[in-house]
């Protein structure tokens, strides 16, 4: 079963402190988008138990294998079904937790009921707040059964489900007719696909005999162990406060697993942690009881004492669940509960036993799932134990399952079942992916989907030139990193294949399908240099360059010119597609810009070394704005403008342009040229009387410059309507003399 646990914190004084945590003990669980495993999902399932909408719950990920749900604002947010999904592929598993309101009218005596196919299930709802009305039972949200309130037995409403079948599984609820559904008692019924003690497609296989309340999985025959127990048959107790398939997880908080409900993959369901019981898992086990929900009784013999977490603690000389076995009876020692081998390997399996009389080689045997008995090929006898070694024939997939080591002496017998997992070495389903290529190297992503079993321990890349009969070159790489194949030949096709391995002897899988990857052509090695450049306009630049003279043909397809505008952080690239070209005209540049210029030879997609850079300043597109523009009305149709020349001119002004517009007018402005650039005054004539005008102006060199400030002025008096403004200019001094 998948190592997935959903913990609910049941200290319910304040719903805001309530949280659910999903913990995965799976290798690579929840890593997300990579090929090795989808993420853990934890959510409220509103399909069956609908609760009024509230603020969204907060999901927090703690590393790759843990996710926590918080943000419950009121008690009704907690009521209902929560689920956690984890594991990858066919092992994807959903763990379900059902939360009941402690203040509900009806409360379940037991929330999770796991029963076998054909059994009778009895769900019991205890009356917490009585109502004299019908009780409605539902199954997965749909009406199922009715009881009259008189049908309560000893303060409980019972729903008997005879001869249950797997489709009967689901969420059941008992609700008083007048009450809110949130006041219901919610149950979870899990019906195993087989009768008691059986598993497999036709229920033909025998379960291993799960101990300590473990439940046999009807699909794979594994024991799903209660929280706090481990081993193939759940025979071993974890240390207090620990859980997970290998006891690798620790309960949070100082009070250990108190107040926590643990939900595990079906067919286990949910329970308190080992040593705790009660609806909120806050009560310690009564003396003589132990385990999850305190469901187990110690019944220790021969002076054993009961520990509420682990069961009987035996005195020296005794062992067994109830301390019922004398140490003189033979005993299998330290047998691993689970072993893993790769398909078609021939492993050696050791089985050690002690006892009095001392076990010898012939008294220890190994039994396969199909009933075949293997005898040991050799035995190592030590003072305190005998270790028998078994050479296993070549493994096939059918060898997966429960094997048994058995020791028999005149003092008695002992056997220990253990799980053997036969794993299929991984085989890539796709070819590796080319990421980048150069003339002498290829960068390859070896991460591919695969058939067979993980985890992937090593990835081998095999490569050789296409159509070659030479030996393959091999490189061993990290599964999660890209690989660079070096020292290759330029412009050459290579056949590349992936081989995956999993841990253990014989873990190498078959090679994956090949793919063709071609190296790039050779890099151009010549470095051009810039001979010169000249400005052909505010946005045009002529550039020339040359190449060193070398013997042999020129390795190159053309040139790339790069202009870097550092002010704007922009790069302009110009492709010259002839390798014979030594000059280029660059147009559409930004006037007044400082550029850094260089040139490179290119071949295929590869660039050679860049020339030493040159720095070029293009002239600005136009001069700065005229200064101190001033307007003065002279009559009812004339206004004089005066100004000062722009500062820091890049060249001689060719003309000025004046813009005239009626203030608040909707029409287009009028532009008037002042063709004598040395002047600093002009008269605008033909204006309308008593009219307010707006004026601004700019100078032109090779292009128009910036606008000056805008000035306002009104014409005088009530003259006749003019035909339109015209201009007369002269030197400022002369204008003033007038």
């Amino acid at each position: 079963a998948v190592d997935l646990t959903l913990l609910a914190n049941l200290r319910l004084t304040d719903p805001q402190r309530f949280f659910l945590t999903c913990v995965s003990g799976e290798a690579g669980a929840g890593r997300g988008s990579d090929a090795w495993g989808p993420p853990l999902l934890l959510e409220k399932d509103d399909r069956i138990v609908r609760t009024p909408p509230g603020p969204p719950l907060r999901l927090a990920r703690n590393g790759s294998h843990q996710v926590t749900l918080r943000g419950f604002s009121k008690p009704s947010d907690l009521v209902g079904v929560f689920s956690c999904v984890g594991g990858a592929g066919a092992r994807r598993t959903r763990v379900i937790y059902v939360h009941n309101s402690p203040g509900a009218h009806l409360l379940p005596d037991k929330v999770t009921h796991t029963v076998n196919k054909g059994d009778t299930a009895v769900l019991s709802a205890r009356v917490h707040k009585e109502k004299q009305t019908d009780v409605i039972w539902k199954s997965n949200g749909s009406y199922f059964y009715t009881l009259d309130w008189h049908e309560a037995q000893d303060g409980r409403f019972l729903l008997q489900l005879p001869n249950v079948q797997p489709p009967s599984s689901g969420i059941y609820s008992a609700t008083y007719l007048e009450a809110s559904p949130l006041g219901s008692a919610f149950f979870r019924l899990i019906v195993r696909g087989c009768g008691a003690g059986r598993w497999g497609p036709g229920c033909t296989k025998e379960c291993p005999g799960c101990l300590h309340g473990g439940v046999c999985h009807d699909h794979d025959g594994e024991c799903v162990c209660p929280p706090g127990f481990t081993g193939t048959r759940c025979e071993q107790a974890c240390r207090e406060g620990r859980f997970g398939q290998s006891c690798q997880e620790q309960c949070p908080g100082i009070s250990g697993c108190r107040g926590l409900t643990f939900c595990l993959p079906d067919p286990y369901g949910c329970s308190c942690g080992s040593g705790w019981r009660g609806s909120q898992c806050q009560e310690a086990c009564a003396p003589g009881h132990f385990g999850a929900d305190c469901r187990l009784q110690c019944q220790c013999q021969n002076g054993g004492t009961c520990d509420r977490f682990s069961g009987c603690v035996c005195p020296s000389g005794w062992h067994g669940v109830h301390c019922e076995k004398s140490d003189r009876i033979p005993q299998i020692l330290n047998m691993a509960s689970e072993l893993e081998f790769n398909l078609e390997t021939m492993p050696r399996i050791n089985c050690a036993a002690a006892g009095n009389p001392f076990p010898v080689r012939g008294s220890i045997e190994l039994r396969k799932p199909d009933g075949t008995v293997l005898l040991s090929t050799k035995a190592i006898v030590e003072p305190e134990k005998t270790t028998a070694e078994f050479e296993v024939p070549r493994l096939v997939l059918a060898d997966s399952g429960f094997w048994e080591c058995r020791v028999s002496t005149s003092g008695g017998q002992d056997s220990r079942r253990f799980k053997v997992n036969v794993k299929v070495p991984p085989v890539p389903l796709a070819a590796p992916r080319l990421l980048t290529k150069q003339s002498r190297q290829l960068v390859v992503s070896p991460l591919v989907s695969f058939s067979g079993d993980g985890p992937i321990s090593t990835v081998r890349l095999h490569y050789r030139p296409q159509d070659s009969t030479m030996d393959w070159s091999t490189i061993v790489v990290d599964p999660s990193e890209n690989v660079t194949l070096m020292n290759l030949r330029p412009k050459t096709g290579y056949s590349v294949r992936v081989q995956l391995s999993r841990p253990g002897e014989g873990g190498e899988g078959a090679w994956g399908p090949p793919t063709l990857m071609t190296t790039d052509c050779p890099e151009p090695l010549l470095q051009p240099w810039l001979e010169g450049w000249h400005v052909e306009g505010t946005d045009r630049l002529r550039v020339s360059w040359s190449l060193p003279l070398v013997p042999g043909p020129l390795v190159g397809d053309g040139f790339l010119l790069r202009l870097w505008d550092g002010t704007r952080g922009q790069e302009r690239r110009e492709n010259v597609s002839s390798p014979q070209a030594r000059t280029a005209l660059l147009t559409g540049l930004t006037p007044g810009t400082h550029y850094q210029l260089d040139v490179q030879l290119y071949h295929c997609t590869l660039l050679g070394p860049a020339s030493p850079p040159a720095h070029v300043l293009l002239p600005p597109s136009g001069p700065p704005a005229p200064r101190h523009l001033h307007a003065q009305a002279l009559s009812d149709s004339e206004i004089q403008l005066t100004w000062k020349h722009p500062e820091a001119l890049p060249g001689p002004i060719s003309k000025y342009v004046v813009e005239v517009q009626v203030a608040g007018g909707a029409g287009d402005p009028l532009w008037i040229d002042v063709d004598r650039p040395e002047e600093t005054s002009t008269i605008i004539r033909g204006l309308n009387a008593s009219t307010r005008y707006l004026f601004r102006m700019r100078a032109s060199i090779q292009g128009l410059g910036d606008w000056s400030n805008t000035v306002e002025e009104s014409t005088l008096g009530n003259g006749l309507q003019a035909e339109g403004p015209v201009q007369e200019s002269r030197a400022a001094e002369e204008g003033l003399d007038q």
């Epitope: 609908r50 609760t51 007719l177």
Partner: antibody, heavy 127, light 109 residues
Framework: EVQLLESGGGLVQPGGSLRLSCAAS????????MMWVRQAPGKGLEWVSG????????LYADSVKGRFTISRDNSKNTLYLQMNSLRAEDTAVYYC????????????????????WGQGTLVTVSS | DIQMTQSPGTLSLSPGERATLSCRAS???????VAWYQQKPGQAPRLLIY???TRATGIPDRFSGSGSGTDFTLTISRLEPEDFAVYFC??????????FGQGTRLEIK
């Protein structure tokens, strides 16, 4: 398809007895509360009796209490009404009906209703 | 015992008109316990509305129910010829378990 089919009606003298049956099909009969409702000629509907799924709880209208007995055989999917000491005022069409329980809204309480009815059987008590 | 009283006894309207049928409980009741039924001559009643306001499966949306406390209403927004029938309100009670109103006859004007 859910079907309820009443039978056993007929003409009977005052003081006489009659047993009505209601054969159910198309649903899991043993899980539903069932009712008998009657309608005198030209009059309204009157509830007569009800029985819960287990058969352990039965309910009667005051007008028939002590004279009528409701029962069910879940193995035969059949509802019964044993009518003794019949009176002229018991003359009516007798319907059997199934009680269903609905979620009236996503979050509100459950709402009962008589969702399927038989076609009725006429009982005439007359001398 | 609680009683359910329907009004009017008879309602004469034309197709296309709006019908409003009333049902009053003799004391306040839980709304989820109120249902409405339609009965045509020679036929068994048919469940229209449960929980005072939720239409049963297959019931056209011209039928709607409302009300709370003691007063409940069945509204047919636009009468179709097949809607002319007798309508009963019903309460799911304690004792007696099922209480019907005396019915409202809806006839063509």
């Amino acid at each position: 398809e859910v079907q309820l089919l009443e039978s056993g009606g007929g003409l009977v003298q005052p003081g006489g007895s009659l047993r009505l049956s209601c054969a159910a099909s198309g649903f899991t009969f043993s899980r539903y509360t069932m009712m008998w409702v009657r309608q005198a000629p030209g009059k309204g509907l009157e509830w007569v009796s009800g029985i819960y799924p287990s058969g352990g709880v039965t309910l009667y209208a005051d007008s028939v209490k002590g004279r009528f007995t409701i029962s069910r055989d879940n193995s035969k999917n059949t509802l019964y009404l044993q009518m003794n000491s019949l009176r002229a005022e018991d003359t009516a069409v007798y319907y059997c009906a199934r009680v269903n329980y609905y979620d009236s809204s996503g979050y509100g309480p459950i709402a009962p209703g008589l969702d399927y009815w038989g076609q009725g059987t006429l009982v005439t008590v007359s001398s | 015992d609680i009683q359910m009283t329907q009004s009017p006894g008879t309602l004469s309207l034309s197709p296309g008109e709006r019908a409003t049928l009333s049902c009053r409980a003799s004391r306040s009741v839980i709304i989820s316990y109120v249902a409405w039924y339609q009965q045509k001559p020679g036929q068994a009643p048919r469940l229209l509305i449960y929980g005072a306001s939720t239409r049963a499966t297959g019931i056209p949306d011209r039928f709607s129910g409302s009300g709370s406390g003691t007063d409940f209403t069945l509204t047919i927004s636009r009468l179709e010829p097949e809607d002319f029938a007798v309508y009963f309100c019903q309460l799911y009670g304690r004792s007696p378990r099922i209480i019907f109103g005396q019915g409202t006859r809806l006839e063509i004007k």
